[in-house]
Every structure is written in structure tokens, then in C-alpha cells.
Interface confidence: low
């Protein structure tokens, strides 16, 4: 089922069929699918609190002096929570010794705000996008991406860090949200569900898509991620929904075909460089934008979210590979790595196109409740 204004206009696809079938789904304890206390009431099909590397596992951008001529990318530490190997659970992990963050995990103690107070902030992510209520903002120009078509060498690090699969991006990938709003891409990662259960972070009118890609960027105004955390516009994430289509997506297959190599939590492999822009929708002009937060602790706010209107199509087999190949810590499947949608609390989502206007003949004349000017508050 597709929702108005969120359909795939020109799917990315093609390529040959992959040979390997991944592991199938494992029954997960019901705890993983229960809402948390900070969830909006009545929300269904939610896992517990999120535990992906997502935005919180950001590479650190070092000053150029440390590595002549290029930016050095390193993972910030993440955290590990104990898990009962008899009861598979998705837990965060510890990448390095000396982590100073508290433990956090899906659907259990401690509550995220206890891990990081910002997680109780008023302007959190992800959110439910309601196109009818979005403010059409003609000033939102098409996104500009430069340097996203990478050559095969040097190879890139693809890592299963226990709560997502993350591709570390090299220096030189530049993105502009508009004049004077320039960013550098740091990493991309995915969010997914389980067999028959969607796992996107953002939703559209309550509809959850099978999966979602996030490409995380650092503002050029900052040299390091830790400097940008919590600063308005310091970080920007490009997000796109992934859904099922009839053809294999050859761009994604370059990553998905390597997942079995990193099935074990903490493992990594090297993959040839690829066209990162091919992992995103082709229409850079139609998107929703709002200010939110990282979707995992430390839940830092001030993050500019850009959610494409167009979706990306993957084959059913590819979506199955994504959701059923990786393992997390202990005896847990790496599945359902998404956070519940958070209240807007007065925020207005902007749209670069008139999203409230539905071309469907059955649709009533829409009422545009918000304007672009109101969205800046």
C-alpha cells in the first residue's frame, strides 16, 4: 500500500539477481515490540527504544593537521547493554574500551532520558509526516550533491556495529541544502524491521515503510561532530524510505551482497566505492524538511532532517536480506532497529512542493493549515 505523495516515481533498479538467500526471521520476544513510556499513545508495530548506530555512531572529523590533505573519520564510541543469551534482544554494543556513555537498549531500562537528558527534549526525531499539514516552502530548492559518485578505490568500510550496518564515507562528499547551508557526508546506515514487519523510522500519516536509509552530514561550519552536536543545523541527515518493487536494485546490491560477511556483530569488511547518490531517490527537488534530533542517545537536537518524497525500490529478496542477515550482540537478531515517532510539539514540517495538494479525484479540497513563514519558528 502506498500513501499519497510518497510513491516511487522512478524506481532505482536493474542489475542481476543475487544468489544468496539470507537467514530467515527469528521469533523475537514480545518485549521488542512493545511501546515505551515516551511513545505516543495508540502507536502500534513499534519495537522498543532504538539501538542502532545510526546518527549517534557518528564518525569524528579530525583537523587536517592530523592527516595531511584529508579528513580523518573515526567512530565515536557507542555503548553496550547486557543481554540474556537465552532471550534474543537487540542491544547496543561497545566498539571500544573506555566508553563513558551509559548503557541503553531497546525497550528496557534505563529510560533514554536517564542515559541522555536530551532524549526527553521537545524536538525529537523521528516524526510522523502528514503531507496535508506540511508547509509548502518554495524557497526549498533542489538538493545539491557533489562528489557522491565514488570510484571503486579506495574501498569503504562496511560495518555491523551491533545495531545497524554502517558505511563510512570518505572525505569529499559535499551536500548543500541551499545557499550557505553546506555539509559533508560522513556515513550512511539503514533502519529496518523484520519479516512482514516494516522498520522505517519516519512514518507518513502513520504508515511505516519497510526500511529507511540515513546519510549523515556535518556542517562545514564545524570541524568535528562533537562540536556540532546540539547546534542548530550542525548536523543534517538525508532520509529516504525503502519499499518493495519488482526489480533488484543494483546500487543496493553492492552493499546487501556483502552483508553475510559481516553477519557477526562487530565485524566489518571493505567494499568498493560506489555511487552513493544511487542509493537515494532520483528526485532531489521534492522533500520534507524539519528540525529534529539524533534518533538514538545522545538524541542531540538541532539536526536538519530532509526526507525525500520519492521512495527507493528494492526487491523483496533484497529487503529480506537486509532484515534477516545481521546479528546483534549475544543471541539477538539485528532487527526492528527503529525508534518510535516523537511528537512534533508545535514544529511545522516544511515541504519543497505543494504536498497538501492531492491529485487524487477522490480527495477533498485540502486545507493548507501551515505556511512556509510559520515553519521557521
Amino acid at each position: 500500500q502506498r500513501l499519497p505523495r510518497m510513491q516511487e516515481d522512478s524506481p532505482l533498479g536493474g542489475g542481476s539477481s543475487g544468489e544468496d538467500d539470507p537467514l530467515g526471521e527469528e521469533d523475537l520476544p514480545s518485549e521488542e515490540d512493545s511501546p515505551r513510556e515516551e511513545d505516543p499513545p495508540g502507536e502500534e508495530d513499534l519495537p522498543g527504544e532504538e539501538d542502532l548506530p545510526g546518527e549517534e555512531d557518528l564518525p569524528e572529523v579530525k583537523p587536517k593537521s592530523e592527516e595531511e590533505g584529508s579528513l580523518k573519520l573515526e567512530d565515536l564510541p557507542t555503548v553496550e547493554a547486557p543481554g540474556d543469551p537465552q532471550e534474543p534482544q537487540n542491544n547496543a554494543h561497545r566498539d571500544k574500551e573506555g566508553d563513558d556513555q551509559s548503557h541503553w537498549r531497546y525497550g528496557g531500562d534505563p529510560p533514554w532520558p536517564r542515559v541522555s537528558p536530551a532524549c526527553a527534549g521537545r524536538f525529537q526525531s523521528p516524526v510522523d509526516i502528514r503531507p496535508q499539514l506540511a508547509a509548502f516552502c518554495p524557497a526549498l530548492r533542489p538538493l545539491e550533491l557533489l562528489g557522491f559518485q565514488l570510484p571503486p578505490l579506495p574501498e569503504l568500510r562496511l560495518r555491523n556495529n551491533g545495531h545497524s550496518v554502517q558505511l563510512t564515507l570518505p572525505p569529499g562528499l559535499e551536500m548543500a541544502l541551499g545557499p550557505g547551508r553546506e555539509y559533508r557526508a560522513l556515513q550512511l546506515h539503514l533502519h529496518w524491521g523484520a519479516a512482514g514487519r516494516p522498520g522505517s523510522e519516519h512514518t507518513v500519516e502513520g504508515h511505516r515503510f519497510p526500511a529507511e536509509i540515513h546519510v549523515v552530514h556535518l556542517s562545514t561550519a564545524f570541524a568535528r561532530v562533537d562540536e556540532a552536536l546540539g547546534r542548530p543545523g550542525g548536523l543534517a541527515v538525508l532520509a529516504a524510505f525503502l519499499e518493495e518493487g519488482p526489480e533488484e536494485n543494483s546500487a543496493y546490491e553492492q552493499l546487501l551482497s556483502r552483508l553475510e560477511e559481516i553477519a557477526e556483530e562487530g565485524s566489518e569488511t571493505q567494499v568498493p566505492g560506489l555511487d552513493i547518490s544511487a542509493l537515494l531517490p532520483s528526485d532531489f527537488s521534492r522533500y520534507f524538511q524539519y528540525e529534529g534530533s539524533l534518533t538514538t542517545p545522545p538524541c542531540a537536537q538541532g539536526v536538519i532532517w530532509t526526507v525525500f518524497n520519492q521512495t527507493v525500490m528494492l526487491s523483496a529478496k533484497q529487503l529480506h536480506t537486509l532484515s534477516d542477515t545481521l546479528w546483534g550482540p549475544g543471541d539477538s537478531r539485528l532487527q526492528l532497529n527503529f525508534r518510535a515517532t516523537q511528537p512534533l510539539n508545535g514544529r511545522v514540517i516544511e515541504a519543497s512542493f505543494p504536498a497538501g495538494v492531492d491529485s487524487s479525484p477522490r480527495a477533498a479540497e485540502p486545507v493548507q493549515l501551515n505556511s512556509c513563514l510559520a515553519a521557521g519558528d
Epitope: G24, A263, E264, S267, D331
Partner: antibody, heavy 119, light 107 residues
């Protein structure tokens, strides 16, 4: 080509100990999880123990828990199984096998080494 | 633990005929199932993984199907070199468990 060669089997008295070794070659040993699987005479296959590529995750069958210890030395491309408090029920051919990836199917097996526990 | 039950225990098939082996899991293993062939005096050999994907260098006459709790290994045209014991194994949950095996011979 991938090769797994077990050694260390033999005749041991009940209550005794043995240490099995598995020498791996033809692949990047440190990238693969490994398991020991045994087969009693005329019987089927029984998984014994598992160790992840880095050695950080280990599992045992209930039948050997507390008596057997799996380990690996990635620098030496070697897998080990220390077997203590052996009983007649441990008599079997012991195979070391490579997982295609973490916890996946076993795609390469050694020829096995025979352990006989008898007085 | 998940108990894997194979049937029949012994299967006699005429040369060139189809052999169908069954494997049942006591609870769902989704597609986390492998099939192995073991000839007398030899180590097991991986035939099928993820329930239906043939391993490297395995001929197309071997095919696997099923998911959840019911699985089938089919040998489309049995030849003398296929005489062996065939085992199924689940790797979806610990401990890893094997079926008791099906002995296939020529009628």
C-alpha cells in the same frame, strides 16, 4: 583451497583429558567462525561447540558444557578443543568445520579425528 | 532446543528417479536450514543453505525448499554417486541441531 586438518585424537581412559587441534589453511582464518561437530560410531552428527571469528562469542552443547573448552589462535590459524572429564559417551569422530559466516551453515569440514574413551 | 526430525530413515530409489527427503523442525527456524551429504568414511559436505540456496559446486539436481518447520531436499535424478546419508541442520537458534539423517540407496 580450503583445508581443515584435525589432530590430537586417540584412546583415553574415562575421566581423562585430550586436546584436539584443527589447522586451517587456504582462507583467512580470522574472518570465519568455527565449530566442532562430533559423530559417535554409527550415529548422526552432533554439534559440540562454536567460536566466533574473534573468539568473543562461544557456545557449547549442554552435553559438554563445563567439561570442554573451545579456543582459537588466529595468529596460528588454529582451532582447539580441550576435553576434560571424558566419558564413554564422548567416543566419536570429531570434526572441525567452518561457518560460511557468523552462525551460518558449515561449508567446509575436516576429515575428523577419532576419540575413543575406554578403560 | 529445536529438535529436527528427518523422514524416512531409509529411502531406496531406482536410478534416474526422484528422491524426496523431509525434515521437520519442532519450532520455526524460518529459512535457517542446511542440508549435508555424508558418504561412508567421509566428512559431511554442504549441499544447501538458507533452505534453498545451493552451495558452491553443488549440481542443480539437488534442490531445497520449505521454510518455518517443514523442509524438503529433492534429488531430481538419483545416481549411484548420490548414495549417502543426508542430514538437515538448523542454525536459527542455539544450540545448532541436526536431524537424525536419511540413508539414501539405490533400489
Amino acid at each position: 583451497q580450503v583445508q581443515l586438518v584435525e589432530s590430537g585424537g586417540g584412546l583415553v581412559q574415562p575421566g581423562g583429558s585430550l586436546r584436539l587441534s584443527c589447522a586451517a589453511s587456504g582462507f583467512t582464518f580470522s574472518s570465519y567462525s568455527m565449530s566442532w561437530v562430533r559423530q559417535a560410531p554409527g550415529k548422526g552428527l552432533e554439534w559440540v561447540s562454536y567460536i566466533s571469528s574473534s573468539g568473543s562469542t562461544i557456545y557449547y552443547a549442554d552435553s559438554v558444557k563445563g567439561r570442554f573448552t573451545i579456543s582459537r589462535d588466529n595468529a596460528k590459524n588454529s582451532l582447539y578443543l580441550q576435553m576434560n572429564s571424558l566419558g564413554a559417551e564422548d567416543t566419536a569422530v570429531y570434526y572441525c568445520a567452518r561457518h560460511r559466516s557468523y552462525r551460518f551453515a558449515l561449508d567446509y569440514w575436516g576429515q575428523g579425528t577419532t576419540v575413543t574413551v575406554s578403560s | 532446543e529445536i529438535v529436527m526430525t528427518q523422514s524416512p530413515a531409509t529411502l531406496s530409489v531406482s536410478p534416474g528417479e526422484r528422491a524426496t527427503l523431509s525434515c521437520r523442525a519442532s519450532q520455526s527456524v524460518s529459512r535457517g536450514l542446511a542440508w549435508y551429504q555424508q558418504k561412508p568414511g567421509q566428512a559431511p559436505r554442504l549441499l544447501i543453505y538458507s533452505a534453498s540456496t545451493r552451495a558452491t559446486d553443488i549440481p542443480a539436481k539437488f534442490s531445497g525448499s520449505g521454510s518455518g518447520t517443514e523442509f524438503t531436499l529433492t534429488i531430481s535424478s538419483l545416481q549411484s554417486e548420490d548414495v549417502a546419508v543426508y542430514y538437515c541442520q538448523q542454525y536459527n537458534k542455539w544450540p545448532l541441531t541436526f536431524g537424525g539423517g536419511t540413508k539414501v540407496d539405490i533400489k
